[in-house]
Interface confidence: medium
């Protein structure tokens, strides 16, 4: 066969779909690899061809578009399953070609089983809600294009295994689920089941997402440095180990990059010659406020090191702060020794 631009297996698009549900999968060529869309390609005389490799097989085979009830079909740049079966799992390839041009990409499709409580190995998207922030909504995701706007589907929402009915602060409103005032107790997995008719059949779309209640921007503050502080002095003798923790509290802020770093005499530790190590640990509160600790360590401190300036810095979207550690050299205690002076010798 003649040369074809092969984009390989696009593992970034690990597509997971539920067994026994419709799935519409767009050829990734037009979304991520080529600079033109399907309509342009089609009007230029290019043909889109689909084939697949079954799970644990090496053999590429054509997709059977002659199954009963048109279970698998292609429409423009979309491959349709109405519905999927477990053994549809495999690597799918879409190839765009004519006599002079060829481009193809493969992607993995995993058909996933779920139980009647919607538990499954599906990777779930996370939706963050601000705690006690007023009405917030989540929307049933990835249901566009499955049915025309003239079709009015039935949408049922579940929290975990339970249908959302008469919940205190959670109200189903069609494709949306409204949280009147989000609380920690609202953390969990939420599922919308969209049921719609098509050609005398009924189909279900199941979409589960994880809701995580996080700190509100109303309560967000700039980083707070708990350590070092003015109450602790790091007094060391040369040769001892110097350990200074920098502990910083960050309020949760959506998409904020929290940073902590040390400077020694105004320079980053990597830029100076002393043998210094820094270990970082991170912990989170229930509302995803973050506490970062960076411990600066010098194994055998010199008197020169004890004269340096050690400053802990922190930055978030709310601002930047810095705090110097109080480091000093221990003053040796006076030694009381008995000295033998002249005139006291034995005669």
């Amino acid at each position: 066969s003649e040369r074809c631009d092969d984009w390989g297996l696009d593992t970034m698009r690990q597509i997971q779909v539920f067994e026994d549900e419709p799935a519409r999968i767009k050829c990734p060529l037009f979304e991520h690899f080529l600079k033109f869309n399907y309509s342009t390609a089609h009007s230029a005389g290019l043909t889109l061809i689909w084939y697949w490799t079954r799970q644990d097989r090496d053999l590429e085979e054509p997709i059977n578009f002659r199954l009963p009830e048109n279970r698998i079909s292609k429409e423009k740049d979309v491959l349709w399953f109405r519905p999927t079966l477990l053994n549809d799992t495999g690597n799918y390839t879409c190839m765009l070609r004519n006599t002079t041009y060829c481009s193809k990409v493969a992607f993995p499709l995993e058909v996933v089983q779920k139980d009647s409580c919607f538990n499954s190995p599906m990777k779930l998207p996370v939706h963050k809600l601000y705690i006690e922030y007023g009405i917030q909504r989540i929307t049933c995701p990835n249901v566009d294009g499955y049915f025309p706007s003239s079709v009015k589907p039935t949408i049922t929402w579940y929290m975990g295994c339970y249908k959302i009915q008469n919940f205190n602060n959670v109200i189903p409103e069609g494709m949306n689920l409204s949280f009147l005032i989000a609380l920690i107790s609202n953390n969990g997995n939420y599922t919308c089941v969209v049921t719609y008719p098509e050609n005398g059949r009924t189909f279900h779309l199941t979409r589960t997402l994880t809701v995580k209640v996080v700190g509100s921007p109303k309560n967000a503050v700039p980083p707070v440095i708990h350590s070092p502080n003015d109450h602790v002095v790091y007094e060391k003798e040369p040769g001892e180990e110097l350990l200074i923790p920098c502990t910083v509290y960050f309020s949760f802020l959506m998409d904020s990059r929290n940073e902590v770093w040390w400077t020694i005499d105004g320079k980053k530790p990597d830029d100076i010659t002393i043998d210094v190590t820094i270990n970082e640990s991170i912990s989170h509160s229930r509302t995803e406020d973050e506490t970062r600790t960076q411990i600066l360590s010098i194994k055998k401190v010199t008197s020169e090191d004890l004269k340096r300036s050690y400053v802990c810095h922190a930055r978030s979207a709310k601002g930047e702060v810095a705090k110097a550690a109080k480091v000093k050299q221990k003053v040796p205690a006076p030694r009381y020794t008995v000295e033998l002076a002249c005139g006291f010798g034995a005669t």
């Epitope: 519905p83 009647s116 579940y158 005398g200 009924t202």
Partner: antibody, heavy 118, light 110 residues
């Protein structure tokens, strides 16, 4: 054909497994369901295993009943049985096709009687 | 939870009469409704599926109708062989289901 077996007299709390044996049916193409009927009462769906292997249960059956299948059998595992579970247990085949059709039961077994009594 | 309500629970009709049994779903089930006939000591038998399609070998005096939430089974020119209990059953969803079957209607033929 479809035939149930394993029904017997058990004491409360005893686990019990019922087996539905099929012949001439490719279980990879059909959903199979368990339905029970207490004496003098109506039909009650317990759960189903669909062609691909996923299982679905009635809300009351979750956790206490487990359905599994091999190439020619469909098992119903029951735990913590009480006198309320006394019933004839039927195995039924769903119609071929997808979604709702698999919960249309076109072929039923004769049933097997489970009696739970102390 | 999803419920199927069947009425009446019992009906008595002379031979040649017409029996009407109603089934109501608590939410739309489109046309995913089946009707079964069960005689004492026997297994259930599928009569009608997809609300109105007669199963193989079922006499034409049995007629199913309805869609959405309201469904009807009509037996015209009832015969003594029709004495049985009839059940409706939804097949639209397996989620959050207590029981997809209606409570049953006993038909007595006089």
């Amino acid at each position: 054909s479809v035939e149930e077996s394993g029904g017997r007299l058990v004491t409360p709390g005893t686990p019990l497994t019922l087996t539905c044996t099929v012949s001439g049916i490719d279980l990879s193409n059909y959903a199979m369901s368990w339905v029970r009927q207490a004496p003098g009462k109506g039909l009650e769906w317990i759960g189903s295993v669909i062609s691909g292997g996923s299982t679905y249960y009635a809300t009351w059956a979750r956790g206490r009943f487990t359905i599994s299948k091999s190439s020619t059998t469909v098992d119903l595992k029951m735990t913590s049985l009480t006198t309320e579970d006394t019933a004839t247990y039927f195995c039924a085949r769903g119609c071929p096709g997808y979604n709702g059709d698999k919960y249309t039961f076109d072929l039923w077994g004769p049933g097997t009687l489970v009696t739970v009594s102390s | 939870a999803f419920e199927m309500t069947q009425t009446p629970s019992s009906v008595s009709e002379p031979v040649g009469g017409t029996v009407t049994i109603k089934c109501q779903a608590s939410q739309s089930i489109y046309n995913y409704l089946s009707w079964y006939q069960q005689k004492p000591g026997q297994r259930p038998k599928l009569l009608i599926y997809r609300a109105s399609t007669l199963a193989s070998g079922v006499p034409s005096r049995f007629k199913g109708s309805g869609s959405g939430t309201e469904f009807t089974l009509t037996i015209s020119g009832v015969e003594s062989a029709d004495a049985a209990t009839y059940y409706c059953q939804q097949g639209a969803t397996s989620y959050d289901i207590e029981n997809p079957f209606g409570g049953g209607t006993e038909v007595v033929v006089k």
